[in-house]
């Protein structure tokens, strides 16, 4: 029963290597390195920001989703696989979509940074489906989601006349709703006898906490690298840091408060400590003073604890989505909180500066957000339907959250 399904044994290597060969050919014909003279010190500074994002994606999001008792290997490794594939496709796609007519794609540290952020959205979405899909299905999900996010950004750029690179600010919301929709499309019920696969064990929860710590340390780097203005970059970093600090305090105390015996839940904590970072993500450069970021961190922490308690039940009963990562369900709420905060701050900013375009700016922002959600839902639905095709030989529901389906173990230890 723990043997590889035929799809994974036969289709995956061929499918993945063919795709990789296609990417190599695309890189050969359509890309070249940036020939402009970048100061060496500038290069190092830019690389460090890119490095931070990679640490967040590979270690942070990789370990964050490893909190399933029998699915920790797959969570970490599949995340890395998706990141590696996603970055390659995102670089090409961003290059093709941001220049019209398409010429050669110039690869710079900035384009790698953008691509990493695009790939990170896939990792966030994957939190809703990891354990229920095989690697071949995840490859499809990477390709579709990166393409959908790129398309969203291009559409927003053309309709709302904003810079193509700036539109990544919607990626929290996009990723969350894309993932939820894909999860909704997947086979629902878990037969009796597989519930133990879904149980969170102490060690995986500790590794998930490690992932949360990596994300916590580097989160200011994800909220600031696309900002041009040094002042705005500083604001973004400081505001993110304060919001994260407050959400940690809120997470630990709120988790204890939510428990009848006042005990702290590791699952709640590793989700809620990051709440502040998500909540200020969209508006961190507009927040004028630390106290406001701290209030947002507090609100976000409380929403996270409440969400961690209620959302899984709500998703299960109302939407029929089972066993999505708590962090993922929280992204969907906090992403919206962040977008609403952005709109409020936009109004305040235009009022303070005596700009008469308030209504127009707000309409634009609501329009962008609505479009992001619509494209996330439709592309998520398309992906979900694609993943349900029989050709992928998806894991049987009895084999959900089971590393043994995918991995060669040196020995099958009892109680694994």
């Amino acid at each position: 029963s723990s043997k590889y399904p035929r799809s994974v044994r036969r289709c995956l290597p061929l499918w993945a290597l063919t795709l990789e060969a296609a990417l190599i050919l695309l890189f050969y014909f359509f890309t070249h390195y940036d020939a402009s003279l970048e100061d060496q010190k500038g290069l190092v500074a830019s690389y460090q920001v890119g490095q931070d994002l990679t640490v967040m994606a590979a270690l942070g999001l990789g370990f964050l989703t490893s909190n399933f008792r029998r699915h920790s290997w797959s969570s970490v490794a599949f995340n890395l696989f998706m990141l590696a594939l996603g970055v390659q496709w995102a670089i090409l796609l961003d290059g093709f979509l941001s220049q019209f007519p398409p010429g050669k794609v110039v690869i710079t540290l900035f384009s790698i940074r953008l691509a990493t952020m695009s790939a990170m959205s896939v990792l966030i979405s994957a939190g809703a489906v990891l354990g229920k899909v095989n690697l071949a299905q995840l490859v499809v999900m990477v390709l579709v989601e990166v393409t959908a996010l790129g398309t969203l950004r291009m559409v927003i750029s053309n309709i709302f006349n904003t810079d193509y690179h700036m539109n990544l600010r919607h990626f929290y919301v996009f990723a969350a709703y894309f993932g939820l929709t894909v999860a909704w499309c997947l086979p629902k019920p878990l037969p009796k006898g597989t519930e133990d696969n879904d149980q969170r064990a102490t060690i995986p929860s500790l590794s998930a906490m490690l992932g949360a710590l990596f994300l916590w340390m580097f989160w200011p780097s994800v909220n600031s690298p696309l900002l041009r203005s040094p002042i705005q970059r500083k604001n973004a970093m400081f505001n993110t840091y304060y919001a994260l600090a407050v959400s940690v305090v809120t997470a630990i105390s709120g988790s204890s408060l939510a428990h009848p015996q006042r005990k702290i839940s590791m699952t709640y904590v590793h989700s809620a400590v990051l709440a502040g970072g998500v909540a200020v993500g969209t508006s961190c450069h507009l927040i004028p003073s630390p106290w406001l970021a701290m209030v947002l961190g507090l609100v976000a922490g409380l929403i996270s604890i409440g969400g961690a308690k209620c959302l899984p039940v709500c998703c299960n009963r109302v939407l029929g989505i089972h066993h999505i990562s708590v962090m993922h369900s929280i992204f969907s709420l906090l992403g919206l909180l962040g977008e609403i905060t952005y709109i409020v701050l936009l109004v305040l900013h235009t009022v303070w500066n005596g700009n008469g375009m308030i209504g127009f700016q707000v309409l634009l922002s609501i329009g962008e957000l609505s479009l992001a959600i619509v494209i996330a839902l439709t592309s998520g639905l398309l992906t979900g339907l694609l993943l349900n095709l029989k050709i992928w030989k998806a894991p049987h529901v009895a084999k959900y959250f089971d590393d043994q389906v995918f991995w060669k173990f040196p020995h099958l230890a009892v109680g694994f």
Partner: antibody
């Protein structure tokens, strides 16, 4: 109010290196992007390059074929421009300028703000 | 490299006239276009940024419009102090490029 003042030699020999500095007062250089622009006699404006005051990130005009280096000294709150192998075509008025800030246009690839503060300019002649 | 083409290269108008200067980009620059005024012997001065936003301290008779590739600077009522050369400039990536300039004189 921010003030920018360009300084350096007014006369440079061909094939030598032109070195200019731009002193900034009334603003910290680490909070803005800074550009160098030049204007040849009777001609339009030509952008030379820019530097991010908070990092060492720079972008240069490809037309200057790698002859240009822009740097900063945060402790002195000043910027520098080096242009090597100068010719008579490099004779111009050299300006340093600060990029403004528009909180509603935050993006690394593009600036929504324009160059809101300029120095008075320094006339540089290249002649033997 | 993005080219900025300004027209006309020079114009002469009477005091109080409405003056319009156009600027065309060779590619889409969204609204990342700015207008400058340069008086003889002086440094350029920013008038309008992001295509239509008036820089603080600039008289309201100056206005900007346009998006994508076609932009316009309008002086609603020409004043003696508006005699200058006007430049457009894009900031949609590097290198930044300026238009050739439009010299405005009074009849």
């Amino acid at each position: 109010e921010v003030q920018l003042l360009e300084s350096g030699p007014g006369l440079v020999k061909p094939s030598e290196t032109l070195s200019l500095t731009c002193g900034v007062s009334g603003a910290s250089i680490s909070n803005y992007w800074w550009s160098w622009i030049r204007q040849s006699p009777g001609k339009g404006l030509e952008w030379i390059g820019e530097i991010d005051g908070s990092t060492y990130s720079t972008h240069y005009n490809p037309s200057l074929k790698g002859r240009v280096t822009i740097s900063k000294d945060a402790s002195k709150n000043q910027l520098s421009l080096r242009l090597t192998s100068v010719t008579a075509a490099d004779t111009a008025v050299y300006y340093c300028a600060r990029e403004g800030q528009d909180p509603l246009a935050p993006t690394l690839a593009t600036s929504g703000s324009g160059l809101d503060s300029w120095g008075r300019g320094l006339v540089v002649s290249v002649s033997s | 490299e993005l080219q900025m083409t300004q027209s006309p290269s020079s114009l002469s108008a009477s005091l109080g006239d409405r003056v319009t200067i156009t600027c065309r980009a060779s590619e889409n620059v969204n609204n990342y276009l700015h207008w400058y005024q340069q008086k003889p012997g002086k440094a350029p001065k920013l008038l309008i940024y992001a295509a239509s936003t008036l820089q603080s301290g600039v008289p309201s008779r100056f206005s900007g419009s346009g998006s994508g590739t076609d932009f316009t600077l309008t002086i609603s009522s020409l004043q003696p102090e508006d005699v200058a050369t006007y430049y457009c400039q894009h900031s949609y990536g590097t290198p930044l490029t300026f238009g050739g300039g439009t010299k405005v004189e009074i009849k």
